[in-house]
């Protein structure tokens, strides 16, 4: 943990601009609050300053969690984790953020989707996701349905399906009915990762049944 006692950083961009340019776990402070949260900062990719809000890489963490767990975050920032919807909501309502989603398949290929505008609504509005300005190599159609849906978990069903997408597909996500993505689905190892309806899905890159090897969701202020 690279945090100095006197430092107060809202995001990894502020950490970077303060002179900390090494990848690692830093302590961030909620906007307009003294509450703190630990996050992994990517200080190398694409100019650095990225706050990692989600990472999947080895299946070591269970992502079939409750609403409260997705709200406050879970996992290990140095490995698989979810930063927390409340922090991300508060942060992205302070200023304009971009969202970059980096994906890896099991054949050694990588792709990304970059949204030039990103924010999460408040908990009262079920942390609805808002995305605009899609570019990147992981599909010209957004695999997160637009306009965004409310967040759903196994104990908080806010999707547009008479089924319960979070229970059926596992993991908390901005399910539609149920929609073309779920980066918080079940982790399947190599050679068991095809024809999996409840895996880690990004439809407009790999299709419906392909479960990805690794994913990272990261945010950064648009004016970085």
């Amino acid at each position: 943990d690279y945090k100095d006692d006197d430092d107060k950083f809202r995001d990894c961009a502020e950490v970077f601009k303060s002179g900390h340019t090494t990848n690692g776990i830093y302590t961030l402070t909620f906007p307009n609050s003294t509450e703190e949260i630990k996050a992994y900062c990517d200080m190398e990719a694409g100019g650095g300053g990225w706050t990692i809000i989600q990472r999947r890489e080895d299946g070591s963490v269970d992502f079939q969690r409750t609403w409260k767990e997705y709200k406050v975050g879970f996992g290990n920032p140095s490995g698989e984790y979810w930063l927390g919807n409340e922090f991300v909501s508060q942060l992205t309502n302070q200023q304009r953020y971009v969202l970059k989603i980096h994906l890896k398949d099991w054949e050694g290929n990588e792709a990304y989707s970059l949204y030039e505008h990103f924010y999460l609504s408040s908990e009262e509005l079920n942390y609805r996701i808002h995305l605009k300005g899609l570019t990147g190599t992981a599909g010209k159609i957004s695999s997160i349905a637009q306009p965004g849906n409310d967040f759903s978990t196994k104990d908080g069903d806010n999707d547009k399906c008479i089924c319960k997408c979070s229970q059926m597909l596992t993991g908390g996500w901005w399910f539609d009915a149920c929609g073309p993505s779920n980066l918080n689905g079940m982790y399947y190892p190599q050679r068991q990762n095809t024809n999996k309806f409840n895996g880690i899905k990004w439809y407009y890159w790999k299709g419906s049944g392909y479960s990805l090897k690794a994913t990272t969701m990261m945010i950064r202020p648009a004016d970085f």
Partner: antibody, heavy 121, light 107 residues
Framework: DVQLQESGPGLVKPSQSLSLTCTVT?????????WNWIRQFPGNKLEWMGY???????SYNPSLKSRISITRDTSKNQFFLQLNSVTPEDTATYYC??????????????WGQGTSVTVSS | SIVMTQTPKLLLVSAGDRVTITCKAS??????VAWYQQKPGQSPKLLIY???NRYTGVPDRFTGSGYGTDFTFAISTVQAEDLAIYFC?????????FGGGTKLEIK
């Protein structure tokens, strides 16, 4: 259901200020989304004028920036357009509308029925 | 500002025809393009958003496609109630801008 209703004078004299009100029912303007003013000139050309977001931040069309102000009254769930120093070229039908994104311009899913404004002496 | 050039300006069609309207953006608009229908005496109504997503309650005869600078709107089987002006709009960059409109008239 979300409904928007424009109101204001139908006739404004040149060099004066145009003031319009949009009253929103069925959704709180402080909850989410951006709340826009758009106008349609005779001949059907549409022009986005600006918005006030749910958080209270504003964004204006640069072509109008020196003349336009959008404000709100959250207790009445209303937002307002003021356009200063009007000329006959500001004659149009004025619409208020809700856009699907709260912090930036976006497509607009709910529109008022429009109010016609003529600028003439 | 991004200029949206919409063609044609007028479409004269018969009920049952398929019609296509195009919008060309002066620079990339990603997939941030919407299509509206405005019937006589009414306000515009959102039909398509994010280039290809049909808005709630919009009949599936209305479709949109495109990415970047070239966008297409189609009505697969025109009906008499489709008499209207159709507008494209980009909202990729501010200020959002509209096409000049296509007036659809039924023979």
């Amino acid at each position: 259901d979300v409904q928007l209703q424009e109101s204001g004078p139908g006739l404004v004299k040149p060099s004066q200020s145009l003031s319009l009100t949009c009253t929103v029912t069925g959704y709180s303007i402080t909850s989410d989304y951006a709340w826009n003013w758009i106008r349609q000139f005779p001949g059907n050309k549409l022009e986005w004028m600006g918005y006030i977001s749910y958080s209270g931040s504003t964004s204006y069309n640069p072509s109008l920036k020196s003349r336009i102000s959008i404000t709100r009254d959250t207790s009445k769930n209303q937002f307002f357009l003021q356009l200063n120093s009007v000329t006959p070229e500001d004659t149009a039908t004025y619409y208020c509308a809700r856009s699907t994104f709260g912090h930036y311009v976006s497509s607009m899913d709910y529109w008022g029925q429009g109010t016609s404004v003529t600028v003439s002496s | 500002s991004i200029v949206m050039t919409q063609t044609p300006k007028l479409l004269l069609v018969s009920a049952g025809d398929r019609v296509t309207i195009t919008c060309k953006a002066s620079q990339s608009a990603s997939n941030d393009v919407a299509w509206y229908q405005q019937k006589p005496g009414q306000s515009p109504k959102l039909l398509i958003y994010y280039a290809s997503n049909r808005y709630t309650g919009v009949p599936d005869r209305f479709t949109g496609s495109g990415y970047g600078t070239d966008f297409t709107f189609a009505i697969s089987t025109v009906q008499a109630e489709d008499l209207a002006i159709y507008f494209c709009q980009q909202d990729y960059s501010s200020p959002p801008t509209f096409g000049g409109g296509t007036k659809l008239e039924i023979k």
